[in-house]
């Protein structure tokens, strides 16, 4: 189904727990690695093992893990050994929740608010720092001002607007509409001493199957930066999309199954059917990523207990003009993305 978790890739069966503290050795030195690295399923990161020896397919959520077979760091997973007391040898990959942040070498705890300087108030939310400006420039440059400048005023924290062509000022001056002025920023608008800010959605945490995407927004009653999340499924893991590429074409940017299906999540089923579009694949060195998309709310009904709703990425179109070297490392190409904004809301 459209939102089913990716299948686990490699599992370890823990030895029976004994009343002993002897731990098995998972690392061997010198390193013994296969001649060629493994081929990981689409969406699973190829990483160096915990022994710092060999390339392995990262363990996924719910998989067993050891000091050698480590959990996928790109998905915010860690190895939870709490079920293997007292040996702490074999754990289960779990999601990191409420991680702290590091900014300019200073560590902040999850939920902590701080002022890195006099101009911003920031909050650490699950590893991401969201900030709101404290300098709300009350008087934007006037319409007649062709070259406005923000200048530092001695003894004051916030910069002030100055206009170099004051001498040519017309008799009647008009203030810029503060909304129009603020809207010139990407996603900022001014309301009641709060500059609303919403970051772009992060890339989906998986290249196939169910993943998560996050963003920081302070568009709320308290003007407080909060992390928002949505489910995402760029493409199904169990469909070979290459088979659907038309003759003479190098890409199938969008794959859309014939049948409408229900989304499923943790045993709960969406209250209506959907026929989503997924990003496709190319036969050359290009990757397809969402280009035109939106966020929809999906209602789920559970067999026992109350239902719930989740925000879900809804893909309308995908862009396939980005080179991608390693499809298994979902962050391998972030630095090479061109200035290409995803059209999304």
């Amino acid at each position: 189904t459209a939102l089913s978790p990716t299948p686990t890739t490699m599992t370890f069966t823990p030895a029976p727990l004994e009343e002993t503290t002897t731990r098995p050795e998972f690392c061997k030195w010198p390193c013994e690695c296969p001649q060629s690295p493994p081929r990981c399923p689409l969406g699973v990161s190829l990483i160096t093992d915990g022994c710092e020896c060999c390339k392995i397919c990262a363990q996924q959520l719910g998989d067993n893990c050891t000091e050698a077979a480590i959990c996928d760091p790109h998905r915010g997973l860690y190895c939870d050994y709490s079920g293997d007391r007292p040996r702490y040898a074999i754990g289960v990959c779990a999601q990191v929740v409420g991680v702290g942040c590091v900014l300019d070498g200073v560590r902040y705890t999850n939920g902590e608010s701080f002022q890195p300087n006099c101009r911003y108030n920031c909050t650490c939310i699950d590893g991401t720092v969201g900030c709101t400006p404290l300098c709300l420039s009350p008087r934007p440059p006037r319409l007649w001002c062709r070259q406005p400048r923000h200048v530092r005023v001695p003894g004051q924290c916030c910069e002030q607007w100055v206009c170099d062509d004051d001498a040519r000022r017309p008799r009647q001056t008009a203030l810029l509409d503060t909304r129009a002025f603020a809207a010139s920023g990407a996603v900022e608008q001014r309301y009641e001493n709060c500059i609303a800010y919403t970051s772009p959605w992060s890339p989906c945490s998986t290249t196939c199957g169910l993943g998560i995407s996050t963003r920081i927004s302070n568009v709320n009653a308290r003007c407080w930066p909060e992390q928002e999340s949505r489910l995402c499924n760029l493409r199904p893991c169990d469909v070979d999309i290459q088979l659907h590429i038309k003759a003479g074409k190098k890409c199938l940017a969008v794959y859309q199954p014939e049948e409408a299906t229900n989304f499923t999540l943790a045993g709960c089923v969406s209250t209506r059917t959907y026929r989503p579009k997924y990003c496709g694949v190319c036969t050359d060195n290009r990757c397809c990523i969402p280009y035109k998309s939106k966020t929809i709310s999906v209602d789920f009904q559970c067999p026992e207990g109350p239902g719930f709703s989740r925000q879900v990425l809804w893909i309308n179109a995908c862009f396939c003009n980005l080179s991608c070297r390693n499809p298994n490392d979902i962050f391998a190409d972030l630095e090479s993305y061109p200035d290409f904004e995803e059209i999304a809301n």
């Epitope: 074409k249 940017a253 496709g280 035109k292 309308n316 809301n345």
Partner: antibody, heavy 121, light 113 residues
Framework: EVQLVQSGAEVKRSGASVKVSCKLS????????IHWVRQAPGKGLEWMGG????????VYGDKFKGRVTVTEDPSTDTAYMDLKRLTFEDTAIYYC??????????????WGQGTLVTVSS | QSVVTQPPSVSGAPGQRVTISCTGS?????????VHWYQQLPGTAPKLLIY???NRPSGVPDRFSGSKSGTSASLAITGLQAEDEADYYC?????????????FGGGTKLTVL
């Protein structure tokens, strides 16, 4: 009802560039793409370029490659067509037209009113 | 010249039936891509008349019909009326090694006698 409103007529010198805008209402650029088609005086329709939903990239007609740039601004639901190094042969009416982002949907549902671009010496 | 070919002109008396042909190749119409038809009245922008070979958008009279076979297609207009006098263009999609292109026929001028 989907409507496309284009910018006004332009007179340009040979060798200059022109940028024509196309404002969409009644739908959003999240759900469709805008293509550009031109028509020289007394001649037929000539497709210039637009986003190819199935190829996942902006594609251009062979005749215009390297000279035309098509862009979309989703925040204002406006599309732009930028044509460089104008010659007298570029004197034409330039139309924007919509294509729904649906597999296999290769036709133009709605058209703008057209923008006349005249290239003079 | 156009990748897709149309006759430059056709004519007919009011009430008559006329057809306009549209001939392509194996990289467009013959490759299975649909044919669409547009009507352009004098001094106005083109308007979608037939999509997907034979489908009419709402508001288009059933006097207009389209069909496709192999590498060609045709538009038929029955019960010809004076207001049908216009230019008619067929359009398809062309996928070749040089890339993807939307292709128009050269246009056919319909004169109502």
């Amino acid at each position: 009802e989907v409507q496309l409103v284009q910018s006004g007529a332009e007179v340009k010198r040979s060798g200059a560039s022109v940028k024509v805008s196309c404002k969409l209402s009644g739908d959003t650029l999240t759900d469709l793409s805008i293509h550009w088609v031109r028509q020289a005086p007394g001649k037929g329709l000539e497709w210039m370029g637009g986003f190819d939903f199935e190829d996942g990239e902006i594609v251009y007609g062979d005749k215009f490659k390297g000279r035309v740039t098509v862009t979309e601004d989703p925040s204002t639901d406006t599309a732009y067509m930028d044509l460089k190094r104008l010659t007298f042969e570029d004197t034409a009416i330039y139309y924007c037209a919509t294509i729904k982002d649906i597999p296999g949907r290769y036709y133009f549902d709605f058209w703008g009113q057209g923008t006349l671009v005249t290239v003079s010496s | 010249q156009s990748v897709v070919t149309q006759p430059p002109s056709v004519s007919g008396a009011p009430g008559q039936r006329v057809t306009i042909s549209c001939t392509g190749s194996s990289s467009n119409i013959g490759a299975g891509y649909d044919v669409h038809w547009y009507q352009q009245l004098p001094g106005t922008a083109p308007k979608l008349l037939i999509y997907g070979n034979s489908n009419r958008p709402s508001g288009v009279p059933d006097r207009f019909s389209g069909s496709k076979s192999g590498t060609s297609a045709s538009l038929a207009i029955t019960g010809l009326q004076a207001e049908d006098e216009a230019d008619y263009y067929c359009q398809s999609y062309d996928s070749s090694l040089s890339g993807s292109n939307w292709v128009f026929g050269g246009g056919t001028k319909l004169t109502v006698l």
